[in-house]
């Protein structure tokens, strides 16, 4: 003969578990239904009488099945510098992530807690590992044969553009400006694996490195130190 | 005049390790990213990882993060890759590069053989 | 990581042929962070189109890059001799920075 089909509430044989999607009441001693996700435990069962469900109140939630006596709370609003990615509804918690141009300083189990804007480099530095969702922006100066006149979260040191006559040298924050005639093309610096350019080298004078007034997030990067802040800006 | 100056041509033994060096002249290696580029014979290329200099925080490819260490000597404006447990998958020549990979060294070659 | 697909992995073109080949990224790329490497034998990669479409030293103006998001492209105009190489694109918009498997051009 088959089986029995147990129905919630029973007791389980010795040594074994509930179902999938049930759970062993302490007090009734029985296998239990659980409440399915944008629901909670209004009464929990007895040897008698199943688990009585009810949805969950505005702003809170379940994710799982569960029998818990209330639902969680969703998170607060999202702030200014972050957008709403995911909605509060009553199976899913509100997920904020930082804005673009902002990148996550201090994360939680999803979503961000704390968003911090993108360090912007500044004249003469360009982007040297680009910013990501949890990691900021690092800036190195231009070398010899490039340069930025930008201050941005973005953008590299360019190559100096070749000049068949130099009217003025490229430095770390401007490009070469050549004389009337029209330059030959913009440059990469002349290396071991480069041509070398028409024209002989621009001066290039290296940018006095500052201080970033950007905050610290040592503690936040995965690998190691925090880069150095130099050539930066904070806002 | 930038240039990446590289060691010397390498024949060692399996098992064993050896530390490859780039001094770059024309820059200052703490105004810089160096990074280290993996090229098998008839293959392409392929990233090993970087090194900030100014403070030593080094980022790898998880492929090479057994095999590879990135460091840095600051007061001899020198990169260094150290590979270790070397075996015939490692023959190849290694390349630094600098921040923006606008310049390159002239390559080591590396050939790991008994 | 991004994974950089270039095609074709080898070609082969004719004297004054336009030639074009792509570079397909797993997920979006920042054009500025698009670079492409010329390679011949026994020689280091050299820096050929830097941020998807500028011109490196010395690369004649046949040359063009063009793209965005996850589809970029090198176009030579009309094919000379001296461009048969094999052509890398590079992103380093997101670490581990990654290398297209190269496409081999060849002078038919």
């Known amino acids: 003969l088959p089986a029995q089909v147990a129905f919630t509430p029973y007791a389980p044989e010795p040594g074994s578990t509930c179902r999938l999607r049930e759970y062993y009441d302490q007090t009734a001693q029985m296998c239990c239904s659980k409440c399915s996700p944008g629901q909670h435990a209004k009464v929990f069962c007895t040897k008698t009488s199943d688990t009585v469900c009810d949805s969950c109140e505005d702003s809170t939630y379940t994710q799982l099945w569960n029998w818990v006596p209330e639902c969680l709370s969703c998170g607060s609003r999202c702030s200014s510098d972050q957008v709403e990615t995911q909605a509060c509804t009553r199976e899913q918690n509100r997920i904020c992530t930082c804005r673009p141009g902002w990148y996550c300083a201090l994360s939680k189990q999803e979503g961000c807690r704390l968003c911090a804007p993108l360090r912007k480099c500044r004249p003469g530095f360009g982007v040297a590992r680009p910013g990501t969702e949890t990691s900021d922006v690092v800036c190195k100066p231009c070398a010899p044969g490039t340069f930025s006149n930008t201050t941005s979260s973005t953008d590299i040191c360019r190559p100096h553009q070749i000049c068949n006559v130099v009217a003025i040298p490229g430095n770390a924050s401007m490009d070469a400006v050549c004389t009337s005639t029209s330059p030959t093309r913009s440059m990469a610096p002349g290396a071991v694996h480069l041509p070398q350019p028409v024209s002989t080298r621009s001066q290039h004078t290296q940018p006095t490195p500052e201080p970033s007034t950007a905050p610290s997030t040592s503690f936040l990067l995965p690998m190691g130190p925090s880069p150095p802040a130099e050539g930066s800006t904070g806002d | 005049e930038v240039q990446l100056q590289q060691s010397g041509a390498e024949l060692v033994k399996p098992g064993a390790s050896v530390k490859l060096s780039c001094t770059p002249s024309?820059?200052?290696?703490?105004?810089?990213?160096m990074h280290w580029v993996k090229q098998r014979p008839e293959q392409g290329l392929e990233w090993i990882g970087r090194?900030?200099?100014?403070?030593?925080?080094?980022e790898y490819d998880p492929k090479f993060q057994d095999k590879a260490t990135i460091t840095a000597d600051t007061s001899s404006n020198t990169a260094y890759l150290q590979l270790s447990s070397l075996t015939s998958e490692d023959t190849a020549v290694y390349y630094c590069?600098?921040?923006?990979?606008?310049?390159w060294g002239q390559g080591t070659t590396l050939t790991v053989s008994s | 990581q991004i994974v950089l697909t270039q095609s074709p992995a080898i070609m082969s073109a004719s004297l004054g042929e336009r030639v074009t080949m792509t570079c397909t990224a797993s997920s979006s790329v920042s054009s500025t962070y698009l670079h492409w490497y010329q390679q011949k034998p026994g020689s280091s990669p050299k820096l050929w189109i830097y941020?998807?479409?500028n011109l490196a030293s010395g690369v004649p103006a046949r040359f063009s890059g063009s793209g965005s998001g996850t589809s970029y492209s090198l176009t030579i105009s009309n094919m000379e001799a001296e461009d048969a190489a094999t052509y890398y694109c590079h992103q380093y918009h997101r670490s581990p920075l990654t290398f297209g498997a190269g496409t081999k051009l060849e002078l038919k």
């Open positions: 941020s998807t479409s």
């Open positions: 090194i900030d200099p100014a403070n030593g925080y080094t």
């Open positions: 590069a600098d921040t923006q990979l606008y310049y």
């Open positions: 024309g820059f200052n290696i703490k105004d810089t990213y």
